[in-house]
């Protein structure tokens, strides 16, 4: 049994920021879950993770240097990406995994969202190459 995911086919990131909403055919209330956003056709880069637990505050992090935040709805997670670079224009895939209660569930691969980064060309300073908020 797989969860279905709906995403916008395309989003334009003006001012180097975008909200990407992942809508699921599953209610996340009172579940332990891991929602993640992946970049590229092969989903090789895990951009952002939102971890939710019925007894804890939502935790959001990126291991790959993206500046991201996350918001939880009953059947959705919205990823808010900031400080995007023009060269990060790509296709982004939502993934959802429910760890508890058993059985483990995940999603059918979605069609993805092309995020087209326009606007200000952020120039990394020599000391800090790229966004590094965890």
């Amino acid at each position: 049994n797989k969860i279905l995911v709906k995403q916008s086919p395309m989003l334009v990131a003006y001012d180097n920021a975008v909200n990407l909403s992942c809508k699921y055919s599953y209610n996340l209330f009172s579940r332990e879950f891991r929602a993640s956003l992946h970049k590229g056709l092969d989903s090789a880069v895990e951009v952002c993770v939102v971890y939710g637990n019925y007894s804890q505050q939502l935790q959001v992090y990126s291991k790959t240097g993206f500046n991201c935040d996350g918001k939880l709805g009953n059947e959705s997670v919205t990823f808010y990406l900031q400080n995007l670079y023009v060269n990060q224009t790509d296709i982004y895939f939502c993934k959802i995994e429910v760890m508890y209660p058993p059985p483990y569930l995940d999603n059918e691969k979605s069609n993805g969202t092309i995020i087209h980064v326009k606007g200000k060309h952020l120039c990394p300073s020599p000391l800090f190459p790229g966004p590094s908020k965890p």
Partner: antibody
């Protein structure tokens, strides 16, 4: 309390295989990866691989990929590490440890270790 | 694979000393760096996670700092029970890798 309890010491001949078990208790087995880390005598720590009991996905260190097999039995919350074609330099203490599946970056609980001696 | 280089490999110190151990990553790992303590014949114990966060039950004399490629573990006032080997470990990307260890011995 949260515990990982490993099987006892093993002595094996070169070319043989060894299977080490790791029984988890005190937490939700499917919320954590189980990792295997080894330590040769007087040496440092070497990550061998991990398995996630929820979907049985595995991740192996290339160095061991063709010789190590990680499995789980979720009904008894136990993970297994089998290492084949043993050589003398596989003599080491083998540890199981866990990391959270949602917050995966550190190993917060460790088994007591299983000594595997490979000798002819 | 990301290489983790620890220094020094060993050091001698006295009770009450301030001890600093460094760890260098071969590429940017942001804050995804953990520190462990291991005593002879025992399993490692987590001390610090995500570069600077003290694990539950770990005394406050232990602290961690750094981000990117360079990290430090500091013991502000060495206690008799702190004589052990310390390892750093990167948790940024698989395969997870450890530093070679730093043995803290009694002077």
């Amino acid at each position: 309390q949260v515990q990982l309890v490993q099987s006892g010491a093993e002595v094996k001949k070169p070319g043989a295989s060894v299977k080490v078990s790791c029984k988890a208790s005190g937490y939700t087995f499917t919320s954590y990866y189980i990792h295997w880390v080894r330590q040769a005598p007087g040496q440092g720590l070497e990550w061998m691989g991990s398995i996630y009991p929820g979907n049985v996905n595995t991740n192996y260190n290339e160095k061991f990929k063709d010789r190590v097999t990680l499995t789980v039995d979720t009904s008894i919350s136990t993970a297994y590490m089998e290492l084949s074609r043993l050589r003398s330099d596989d003599t080491a203490v083998y540890y199981c440890t866990r990391s959270h599946y949602g917050l995966d970056w550190n190993f917060d609980v460790w088994g007591q270790g299983t000594t595997v001696t490979v000798s002819s | 694979d990301i290489q983790m280089t620890q220094s020094p490999s060993s050091l001698s110190a006295s009770v009450g000393d301030r001890v600093t151990i460094t760890c260098h990553a071969s590429q940017n790992i942001y804050v995804w760096l953990n520190w462990y303590q291991q005593k002879p014949g025992k399993a490692p114990k987590l001390l610090i996670y995500k570069a600077s966060n003290l694990h539950t039950g770990v005394p406050s004399r232990f602290s961690g700092s750094g981000s990117g490629t360079d990290f430090t573990l500091t013991i502000s006032s060495l206690q008799p029970e702190d004589f052990a080997t310390y390892y750093c470990q990167q948790g940024q990307t698989y395969p997870y890798t450890f530093g070679g260890g730093t043995k803290v011995e009694i002077k």
